[in-house]
């Protein structure tokens, strides 16, 4: 058993049928010695008397808010949550496996640049009685500071019969140098509580590996005289690290017909312009990627050929 | 400590081409190592990230773009003195700071070159003959060093009398390649910045 926060405790259970559970001793936070009784949740049934209460915690029915009273007055509370260990592996019931970029990916994180700011998000099908708390650091043995905000519900989607909820959080490394070569990964820890179930999820990454630039901006077409060709031009996204000559991007320019089956023409360039043939009803898209370290491509920025 | 904005003559920056070749070569070598050594801990998540140049060179600091010198987090207190007769820019405008940066890069390359050659000698003794260093990568390191054209004492190749532990050698190869790839990215960024300045 360990304390999650004031008056909230997590009981770790080896979870299998007929498991013996864990013996837990609760102590009433009071100078009083006599006449103390204990109850669980809203029940008025007295579970025991005395300054301490010993309970055997086996299942969720044994978890909840234990309250000690004296003469009708509440003295203190202890909320017991359960953390299930199933065959040596902590349960992951609360969050959905996003399966990207690999199986058992519960937290996904992205950064728009090298400033040390990043966003993480996760999915769940649970809509109520759910709380998250996020902590982060650079490295784990001698952790350096990363400050995270509160997790917020950022999207709701319908998937088949189920509703899916996306939560996200923004974090910022306290003293980040965009040019630094990372040797210690960022660690992100999410505590999830659903009703009386506690779970924790972690992700470890280097900012360089989660970079995904914003799409190029100001995408424009300039027709070339007496030609089906057009000059496409664009700019670095505002959110990208500067100076751009140091934090350079490379670009992919794509000409896509109306039909998805039509052949796509693709050009790769380090410049912020390219000359392509603009077909009728086609559209031109451009996306960006760090020129020197192949992390994710940005989403496409698009303009119609007409 | 930082790079001033210099204006080299156009087409006078041979190092940019060499640094791009270097990044390509080390990335290919790392990919090959990860595939060949699939049963070894060779991914970024599994290895310890060690920098053999730590406390010996200070490339990131010495080559910091002018725009980032206002960022206190970028200004570490590591100071290292370097030889300052680089000729990569082939321009008299090469400042002391730029020379410090380029000489730091040169020292990095020299250290990695020695490590890779020592390691290759060990890998050649492996009866499994599982993996060797790409000669192209070693050649590209050499080419960039020549383009940087710094005079520096030659570091003798380390020789080891004890029987090599091939498992450990292959894991060290992965560690070195990961670190060298990161340094090659920094070198490429620096060369691109200098080229644009």
């Amino acid at each position: 058993i360990w304390e999650l926060k004031k008056d909230v405790y997590v009981v770790e259970l080896d979870w299998y049928p007929d498991a013996p559970g864990e013996m837990v001793v609760l102590t009433c936070d009071t100078p009083e010695e006599d006449g103390i009784t204990w109850t669980l949740d809203q029940s008025s049934e007295v579970l025991g008397s005395g300054k301490t209460l010993t309970i055997q915690v086996k299942e969720f029915g044994d978890a909840g808010q234990y309250t000690c009273h004296k003469g009708g007055e509440v003295l203190s509370h202890s909320l017991l949550l359960l953390h299930k260990k199933e065959d040596g592996i902590w349960s992951t019931d609360i969050l959905k496996d996003q399966k990207e970029p690999k199986n058992k990916t519960f937290l996904r994180c992205e950064a728009k640049n090298y400033s040390g700011r990043f966003t993480c998000w996760w999915l769940t099908t649970i809509s109520t009685d759910l709380t998250f708390s996020v902590k982060s650091s650079r490295g784990s043995s001698d952790p350096q500071g990363v400050t995270c905000g509160a997790a917020t519900l950022s999207a709701e989607r319908v998937r088949g019969d189920n509703k899916e909820y996306e939560y996200s959080v923004e974090c910022q490394e306290d003293s980040a140098c965009p040019a630094a070569e990372e040797s210690l990964p960022i660690e992100v820890m999410v505590d999830a509580v659903h009703k009386l179930k506690y779970e924790n999820y972690t992700s470890s990454f280097f900012i360089r590996d989660i970079i995904k630039p914003d799409p190029p901006k100001n995408l424009q077409l300039k027709p070339l005289k007496n030609s089906r060709q057009v000059e496409v031009s664009w700019e670095y996204p505002d959110t990208w690290s500067t100076p751009h000559s140091y934090f350079s991007l490379t670009f992919c320019v794509q000409v896509q017909g109306k039909s998805k089956r039509e052949k796509k023409d693709r050009v790769f360039t380090d410049k912020t312009s390219a000359t392509v043939i603009c077909r009728k009803n086609a559209s031109i898209s451009v996306r960006a990627q760090d020129r020197y370290y192949s992390s994710s491509w940005s989403e496409w920025a698009s303009v119609p050929c007409s | 400590r930082n790079l001033p904005v210099a204006t080299p003559d156009p087409g006078m920056f041979p190092c940019l081409h060499h640094s791009q070749n270097l990044l390509r070569a080390v990335s290919n070598m790392l990919q090959k190592a990860r595939q060949t050594l699939e049963f070894y801990p060779c991914t970024s998540e599994e290895i310890d990230h060690e920098d053999i140049t730590k406390d010996k060179t200070s490339t990131v600091e010495a080559c910091l773009p002018l725009e980032l010198t206002k960022n206190e987090s970028c200004l570490n207190s590591r100071e290292t003195s370097f030889i300052t007769n680089g000729s990569c820019l082939a321009s008299r405008k090469t400042s002391f700071m730029m020379a410090l940066c380029l000489s730091s890069i040169y020292e990095d390359l020299k250290m990695y070159q020695v490590e890779f050659k020592t390691m290759n000698a060990k890998l050649l003794m492996d009866p499994k003959r599982q993996i060797f260093l790409d000669q192209n990568m070693l050649a590209v390191i050499d080419e960039l060093m020549q383009a940087l054209n710094f005079n520096s004492e030659t570091v003798p190749q380390k020789s080891s009398l004890e029987e090599p532990d091939f498992y450990k050698t292959k894991i060290k190869l992965c560690i070195l390649l990961h670190a060298f790839r990161i340094r090659a990215v920094t070198i490429d960024r620096v060369m691109s910045y200098l080229n644009a300045s």
Epitope: W15, Y16, P17, F60, E86, I89, D93 | -
Partner: antibody
Framework: QVQLVQSGGGVVQPGRSLRLSCAAS????????MHWVRQAPGKGLEWVAF????????YYADSVKGRFTISRDNSKNTLYLQMKSLRAEDTAVYYC????????WGQGTMVTVSS | SYVLTQPPSVSGTPGQRVTISCSGG????????VKWYQQLPGTAPKLLIY???QRPSGVPDRFSGSKSGTSASLAITGVQAEDEADYYC????????????FGTGTKVTVLG
């Protein structure tokens, strides 16, 4: 005490269907994940499928994906394996089993796929 | 499809020490617990070892388990005639959990 009693096995022709059941007692069935494991005659153990305690997630071995469906009825304390498009290579003793460090197995039920 | 490799058979005379190896990789045994099962002919498997080296109550202490790196082993010290059975190791793969990974199985024969 924990008990898992299996039923539904038998002889079936290739391409036909069969549903296995596993009735649980002696524990809170709705709190625990459950597996199906099979063993072909003279062969080793092969995992078939898993279902979460609440039925929200199901996992299958590649060899049965798209043909077999694991399900549970927590109100009846019963686990099911619906097997469709059966093949000769599905011939095996099928076991249900609880998930956890200490597990409990059903007695097994024989499924023979033969023409 | 078996990722955990066991020797097909091992044998020993009563009283001898018999060991069975189970070889896997970094993503399975290297990062998860190992279990060992005993299966007597015509019966369901019986749990002998969980959590690499833990014995459930009721399992004789002549059975012991250990794990090192990407391999695990089961030892029977002072093997007895009733130990003649098939033995399976089991673990998970970190990418496919909760799918069970079973070893190829080992037939233990008690001679004499």
């Amino acid at each position: 005490q924990v008990q898992l009693v299996q039923s539904g096995g038998g002889v079936v022709q290739p391409g036909r269907s069969l549903r296995l059941s596993c009735a649980a007692s002696g524990f809170t069935f709705s709190s625990y994940g459950m597996h199906w494991v099979r063993q072909a005659p003279g062969k080793g153990l092969e995992w078939v499928a898993f279902i979460r305690y609440d039925g929200s997630n199901k996992y299958y071995a590649d060899s049965v994906k798209g043909r077999f469906t694991i399900s549970r009825d927590n109100s009846k304390n019963t686990l099911y394996l619906q097997m469709k498009s059966l093949r000769a290579e599905d011939t095996a003793v099928y076991y249900c089993k609880t998930h956890g460090s200490h597990d409990n197995w059903g007695q097994g039920t024989m499924v023979t796929v033969s023409s | 499809s078996y990722v955990l490799t066991q020797p097909p058979s091992v044998s020993g005379t009563p009283g001898q020490r018999v060991t069975i190896s189970c070889s896997g990789g970094r993503s399975n045994i290297g990062s998860n617990h190992v279990k060992w099962y005993q299966q007597l002919p015509g019966t369901a498997p019986k749990l002998l070892i969980y959590g690499n080296d833990q014995r459930p109550s009721g399992v004789p202490d002549r059975f012991s388990g250990s794990k090192s790196g990407t391999s695990a082993s089961l030892a029977i010290t002072g093997v007895q005639a009733e130990d003649e059975a098939d033995y399976y190791c089991q673990s998970y793969d970190r990418g496919t959990h909760p799918a069970l990974l079973f070893g190829t199985g080992t037939k233990v024969t008690v001679l004499g």
